[in-house]
């Protein structure tokens, strides 16, 4: 089988405030079963943004119907942005257990938010 | 107007170092990623390889992957490709081509907006 | 790799389609040749963009993982080849198709 690819194609995105963000990720192998996660930033203090398998997230929804089992298109649009989105989003997959297990991200899309226009 | 001028083409001996560079201009250079494409004569195009708005990351085609090495300087708006080791199947015309966006250098091709008008590489003993 | 038809053909002001598959979701562009070494000319980009000087009879469409290039109203000046290009899974590196010769009649 394929070695899985978390594919983020987006280096940067700009939106102006109030606005929405489409953030793209898509992966090349249902392998291995578990969730997608989104979050912004890394390490110990980043804050998570989507669980395909929690909820809701009021300001999220997601590009494709990630409830299918074929699906490989987990990007998502986040609602009504402010400065405070501003950040670096990460995709991850996670490997089903108990608890889930990171297993491996993409390699981030900065989004900068533009002052609203006047 | 967006223009970017490709030189060091010419004929080049197998084994050594082929070098071209691209001058850009008519855009805030360090904005945009970069790529170079070739086209071998009577075949189709090729992705050669591509670099990201801030040189953080490239990316290169099969063919010349451990070969190539892609380069910015943002100073100056220029890339610059070198192949080591030339060969034969290397000769034709390359192109230089700049991204809509900023990166990732990978995923640029389908994401290019504007062409040089080529510079032609025959490498020959 | 990119899988695009070798050729096509049509007569002027009939509608032309090429699809591109096999480069994942995003992203798509295509890419004219009117003669071999000639530089290529962008006439869509990221899936459905086209840059302001391209006619608006170009335009382009993604499903899935396919992407549809169309020309409405095909004008004898559009014989050429079109390329399409995006990001091969396989190598992790961008690719193009073989590209695909159009024919006006």
């Known amino acids: 089988e394929e070695e899985l690819q978390i594919i983020q194609p987006d280096k940067s995105v700009s939106v102006a405030a109030g606005e929405s963000a489409i953030l793209h990720c898509t992966i090349t192998s249902l392998f291995p079963v578990g969730p997608i996660q989104w979050f912004r930033g890394a390490g110990p203090a980043r804050v998570l943004i989507y669980n395909q398998r929690q909820g809701p997230f009021p300001r999220v929804t997601t590009v494709s119907e990630t409830t299918k089992r074929e699906n490989m298109d987990f990007s998502i649009s986040i609602s009504n942005i402010t400065p405070a989105d501003a950040g670096t989003y990460y995709c991850i997959k996670f490997r089903k257990g108990s608890p889930d297990t990171e297993f491996k991200s993409g390699a981030g899309t900065e989004l900068s938010v533009r002052a609203k226009p006047s | 107007a967006v223009t970017l001028d490709e030189s060091g083409g010419g004929l080049q001996t197998p084994g050594g170092a082929l070098s071209l560079v691209c001058k850009a201009s008519?855009?805030?250079?360090?904005?945009?990623?970069m790529g170079w494409v070739r086209q071998a004569p009577g075949k189709g195009l090729e992705w050669v390889a591509g670099i990201d708005d801030d040189g953080s990351t490239a990316n290169y085609g099969p063919a010349v992957k451990g070969r190539a090495t892609i380069s910015r300087d943002n100073g100056q708006s220029t890339v610059r490709l070198q192949l080591n080791n030339p060969r034969a199947e290397d000769s034709g015309t390359y192109f230089c081509a700049k991204a809509s966006v900023t990166g990732w250098s990978a995923h640029i091709s389908g994401r290019l907006d504007t062409w040089g008008h080529g510079t032609e590489v025959i490498v020959s003993s | 790799a990119l899988t695009q038809p070798a050729s096509v053909s049509a007569n002027p002001g009939e509608t032309v389609k090429i699809t591109c598959s096999g480069g994942g979701i995003y992203y798509y562009g295509w890419y004219q040749q009117k003669s071999p070494g000639s530089a290529p000319v962008t006439l869509i980009y990221e899936n459905d963009k086209r840059p302001s000087d391209i006619p608006s009879r170009f335009s382009g469409s993604t499903s899935g993982s396919t992407n549809t290039f169309t020309i409405t109203g095909v004008q004898a000046e559009d014989e050429a080849v079109y390329y399409c290009?995006?990001?091969?899974?396989?190598?992790?590196?961008?690719?193009f198709g073989a590209g695909t010769t159009l024919t006006v009649l």
């Open positions: 008519g855009f805030t250079f360090s904005s945009y990623a």
């Open positions: 290009g995006g990001y091969d899974s396989n190598t992790t590196s961008g690719i």
